[in-house]
Interface confidence: low
């Protein structure tokens, strides 16, 4: 589900770029990191793909977007939105946010300044 952004992006906007890339590897990579060796999480078989492979796939996808603070923030916000309902408690939400904010550095991208991940209307 896409959050309400209050406008339609034009053809080169970040929103359009975020729509175009596959953020699933990023979501799975972060879930793997916060779940560790726990049971498989929901529909993800977190043992099916090595975490380093998922991270590489995630970075490859993010690399398809322009490396600007705005676009990176949009991507992180969308990942948060996509996974929000799957996060079981407040601690898990905070862990997910922490890992999410570390993602750009893991991929050798610039981290967005003060990217607000509280975009889910209070659900997360």
């Amino acid at each position: 589900m896409r959050r309400e952004r209050g406008r339609q992006g034009d053809s080169s906007s970040c929103e359009r770029q975020v729509d175009r890339v596959n953020l699933k590897p990023c979501e799975q990579h972060i879930m793997q990191r916060i779940m560790g060796e726990q049971e498989q999480y929901d529909s993800y078989d977190i043992r099916s793909t090595r975490s380093s492979d998922q991270q590489q796939r995630c970075c490859d996808e993010l690399n398809e977007m322009e490396n600007t603070q705005r676009c990176m923030c949009e991507a992180l916000q969308q990942i948060m939105e996509n996974q929000c309902d799957r996060l079981q408690d407040r601690q898990m939400v905070q862990q997910f946010k922490r890992e999410l904010m570390n993602l750009p550095q893991q991929c050798n991208f610039r981290a967005p300044q003060r990217c607000d991940l509280d975009v889910s209307g209070g659900r997360c």
Epitope: R3, E4, R5, G6, R7, Q8, G9, D10, S12, S13, C14, E66, N67, T68, Q69, R70, C71, C73, R110, P112, Q113, R114, D116, D118, V119, G121
Partner: antibody, heavy 118, light 107 residues
């Protein structure tokens, strides 16, 4: 025609408070992000604050956070800036401005002058 | 925060001149840059956005270009109405930053 009309400016003592308003017309206000930008006399433009269409996300300039509060009432097509603990350096013309669908700031109000005297 | 360095701060020119104003970002902002014109006592007016896209109703003598983190506003054949102050603004982040402004005055 897009119109943004600011009000609420005036002379205020240092340490005082003021609430600025901006009434929008000519576009779908409830679907637009908005900014406040200010300009001290004879100086350049300085961004103050940003608010998304649903008020879900708000940003402030570092130097103003904690003293200024941006808000909006979509039912009234209105944007607000509550300014507390005002200082001499807050003296400026305050503009409200619309953020376009392509992210840039496209329409500006005529501005309202805030003068802080010590 | 992203810093925008605009030059020159003042520019003296004559009607008919070709004028160039430069703005440099201290880090990548892609094409997220706008140019504004402001006259004394008036609100800024949008001229160009996305580095090179002319806003509707703006005369074609205004143009913008980008080379990496350096952006240029060019006014071909300066008109009497063009004497004003010009600002660049980055919007790569929500925390907008403006250049210091360039005052174009009559030589």
């Amino acid at each position: 025609e897009v119109q943004l009309v600011e009000s609420g400016g005036g002379l205020v003592q240092a340490g005082g408070s003021l609430r600025l308003s901006c009434v929008a017309s000519g576009f779908k206000f409830s679907g637009s992000m908005m900014n406040w930008v200010r300009q001290a006399p004879g100086k350049g433009l300085e961004w103050v604050s940003h608010i998304t269409s649903s008020s879900a996300t708000i940003y402030y300039a570092d130097s103003l956070r904690g003293r200024f509060t941006i808000s909006r009432d979509n039912a009234k097509n209105s944007l607000y800036l509550q300014m507390n603990s005002l200082r001499d350096e807050d003296t400026a013309v305050y503009y409200c401005a619309r953020v376009s669908s392509s992210w840039h700031t496209d329409y500006w109000g005529q501005g309202t002058l805030v003068t802080v005297s010590s | 925060d992203i810093q925008m360095t605009q030059s020159p701060s003042t520019l003296s020119a004559s009607v008919g001149d070709r004028v160039t104003i430069t703005c440099r970002a201290n880090q990548s902002i892609s094409h997220w840059l706008a140019w504004y014109q402001q006259k004394p006592g008036k609100a800024p007016k949008l001229l160009i956005y996305k580095a090179a896209t002319l806003e509707g109703g703006v005369p074609s003598r205004f143009s913008g270009s980008r080379s990496g983190t350096e952006f240029t506003l060019t006014i071909n054949s300066l008109q009497p109405d063009d004497f004003a102050t010009y600002y660049c603004q980055q919007y790569d982040t929500y925390l907008l930053t403006f250049g210091g402004g360039t005052k174009v005055e009559i030589k």
